[in-house]
């Protein structure tokens, strides 16, 4: 079965600064990927970022430099400390469209005790969803 | 068909606050950002701030912070934005237009809202 | 915050000739520029996004180029409905306008 790991990580240099990683574990190829805040698109989420294969990458502020890490994970910067930018209990989602298995979706958040700098290393999340 | 209705043109006296309206169809009106735009007479464009309808979420060009407040009606489909203490540096066409995502940015605009301040 | 110069002003042509108009960023938007043009009345019209990704229903005489800080648009083949005024939008992050550049028919 498919699944989505999501780790959030708080920048030591930069308290509000976070630093959010995504990434597919299946065996399909992806068309896109959508990563939102604030809960799962279409559940009260506001989109962060769309990242297609061949049509680009769109981001919205205060989601910074949006890109690729592999064929099957990206990664985005979150920066910013104004009425619009996230905070430590921030939840975080990200949306996988691939062929053959469908959208796969999962969430994450900061760790309750992390330290600046600090992640717990990428594991599936919890929230998993498949349409 | 992707369609933005705007409010028509309205004349307030100075001090007053007005409100414009922006009508969605044509499209899922929660999954994608509504901006505004503002142009000044014999003047270019200048973009205000934008709302995700989807979760409320908005962010405000630094030069608008207090002047315009933008919300939604999910129900109806519907953005407003409300303009405060308005002064005759307010009176200008006022566009929404909706950021298509990686169709582009601002790919549907409203026909625009004409707004005068004058006592 | 992102500055958007876009040049000429205005400029006049001949109908069936070419036209450029440039935007100059003050840093690297990457190629995240869109192109527009305006008619008073009508709300503005997308042209171009990324560069040069002409909109499905924009005809292949309106084309854009560049990358980094500096980008052009060019119309060839000029016919009466292009009269209008036209602006770059970079929205690399957050949006900034050009200065918009009004043509005429000569």
């Known amino acids: 079965t498919p699944e989505v790991w999501v780790q959030v990580r708080m920048e030591a240099t930069e308290l509000s600064s976070f630093t959010i990683r995504c990434g597919f574990l299946g065996s399909g190829s992806i068309s896109l990927v959508t990563v939102s805040w604030g809960g799962p698109n279409g559940a009260g989420g506001t989109t962060l970022a769309v990242l297609h294969p061949e049509r680009g990458i769109r981001q919205w502020a205060p989601a910074r430099q949006a890109r690729w890490e592999t064929q099957s994970s990206i990664s985005l910067i979150l920066e910013g400390s104004g009425a619009s930018s996230p905070c430590a209990n921030t939840t975080f989602c990200c949306k996988f469209a691939s062929f053959p298995e469908g959208s796969w979706e999962a969430c994450g958040s900061l760790p309750p005790s992390s330290d600046p700098g600090l992640s717990a290393p990428p594991t599936p999340a919890p929230i998993l969803r498949a349409d | 068909q992707v369609h933005l209705q705007q409010s028509g043109p309205d004349l307030v006296k100075p001090g007053v606050s007005v409100k414009i309206s922006c009508k969605a169809s044509?499209?899922?009106?929660?999954?994608?950002?509504i901006n505004w735009v503002k142009q000044r007479p014999g003047q270019g464009l200048e973009w205000i701030g934008w709302i995700f309808p989807g979760s409320g979420t908005t962010y405000y060009n630094e030069k608008f912070k207090g002047k315009a407040t933008l919300t939604v009606d999910k129900s109806s489909s519907t953005a407003y934005m409300l303009l405060s203490s308005l002064t005759s540096e307010d009176s200008a066409v006022y566009f929404c237009?909706?950021?298509?995502?990686?169709?582009?940015?601002?790919?549907?605009w409203g026909q625009g809202t004409t707004l005068t301040v004058s006592s | 915050d992102i500055q958007m110069t876009q040049s000429p002003s205005s400029l006049s042509a001949s109908l069936g000739g070419k036209v450029t108009i440039t935007c100059k960023a003050n840093q690297d938007i990457n190629k995240y520029i869109a192109w527009y043009q305006y008619k008073p009345g009508k709300g503005p019209r997308l042209l171009i996004h990324?560069?040069?990704t002409l909109q499905p229903d924009i005809p292949s005489r309106f084309s854009g180029s560049g990358s980094g800080r500096d980008f052009s648009f060019s119309i060839s083949n000029l016919e009466p409905e292009d009269i209008a005024t036209y602006y770059c939008?970079?929205?690399?992050?957050?949006?900034?306008f050009g200065g918009g550049t009004k043509l005429e028919i000569k």
């Open positions: 990324y560069t040069s």
């Open positions: 044509g499209y899922t009106f929660t999954d994608y950002y």
């Open positions: 237009a909706r950021d298509g995502g990686l169709r582009g940015p601002f790919d549907y």
């Open positions: 939008l970079q929205y690399d992050y957050l949006y900034t």
